[in-house]
């Protein structure tokens, strides 16, 4: 078996629109508690010239500010460069662009490297048909079942979305 | 625990190729993630690729990118580094490793390999 995931079949471009954060997984449980750095969420997505455009949603004093971050193309179909909180190798690890992404990534900042899983949806009433590939991703790369974060409606920021 | 055994090194012209493979005896292959990493003379060990336990997902250094490709097969408990293109900058004592989690950093992975020697000539 070869390492290699491709990018979604219609192109990332299917990517484009609202999500909705579901579940986050790290090794370094600091990283996804509230108000860690990747206690993130996703707000919508957009594709363009082949990198990934994301509106993200992050808490920040009782209040969630809505900042665009870019995740850069690379040589390599399913990875992404990300500059958040160091640099970050953004890995597309599951997609199907009309229910549900799983991505994770390497982050290194100055000289820790971790692990930070995230899995969205387009429709959070169908959030735990899709925990169980969350969970499968997360074992493949190490993360295990008790490193997993599923998140209620008030983490998400709900008030912030338009 | 899980005893490693490197083959397939040598010596290759610049722009060559080699495979490297790497067996495991142990009953955890299964459930560890998989490693290459290289020491070049008078250089520290450095990563040069990783794979999860089932295969499906790779991590490479940019510095082989595009030209080495990680892969395994766990029926066969055998992880394998296909080298393309080498470059002289490639010589190394290349080991094989395995650990818990996908990441590029050494302290990741609890066992190692002896190491098998590739040498690329200019």
């Known amino acids: 078996q070869e390492g290699n995931h491709e990018e979604p079949q219609g192109g990332l471009e299917e990517l484009s629109g609202r999500w909705h954060s579901v579940a986050l997984a790290s090794n370094k449980s600091d990283l996804i508690k509230p108000w860690g750095h990747f206690r993130v969420f996703i707000h919508s997505m957009s594709a363009k010239d082949g990198n990934l455009h994301g509106d993200i949603l992050i808490p920040q004093d009782g209040q969630c500010e809505k900042v665009s971050l870019t995740a850069f193309k690379t040589a390599t179909s399913n990875k992404f460069d990300l500059e958040y909180w160091g640099h970050n190798d953004l890995y597309l690890a599951e997609v199907d662009p009309k229910s549900y992404l799983i991505l994770y990534m390497i982050n290194q900042y100055n000289d820790d490297t971790s692990l930070v899983a995230h899995l969205m949806v387009r429709d959070l009433s169908r959030q735990q048909d899709f925990l169980p590939a969350f969970e499968s991703v997360c074992e493949d790369i190490g993360l295990h079942k008790d490193q997993i974060v599923v998140l209620s409606d008030d983490d998400r920021c709900q008030g912030s979305r338009d | 625990a899980v005893q490693l055994v490197e083959s397939g090194g040598g010596l290759v012209q610049a722009g060559g190729s080699l495979r490297l493979s790497c067996a495991a005896s142990?009953?955890?292959?299964?459930?560890?993630?998989m490693g290459w990493f290289r020491q070049a003379p008078g250089k520290e060990r450095e990563f040069v690729a990783a794979?999860?336990?089932?295969?499906?997902?790779?991590h490479y250094a940019e510095s082989v990118e595009g030209r080495f490709t990680i892969s395994r097969d766990n029926a066969k408990n055998t992880v394998y580094l296909q080298m393309n293109s080498l470059k002289p900058e490639d010589t190394a004592v290349y080991y094989c490793?395995?650990?818990?989690?996908?990441?590029?950093?050494?302290?990741?992975?609890?066992?190692w390999g002896q190491g098998t020697q590739v040498t690329v000539s200019s």
């Open positions: 490793a395995a650990g818990a989690i996908l990441l590029p950093t050494e302290r990741r992975y609890d066992y």
């Open positions: 142990g009953r955890t292959f299964n459930n560890s993630v």
């Open positions: 794979i999860s336990r089932s295969g499906a997902f790779a």
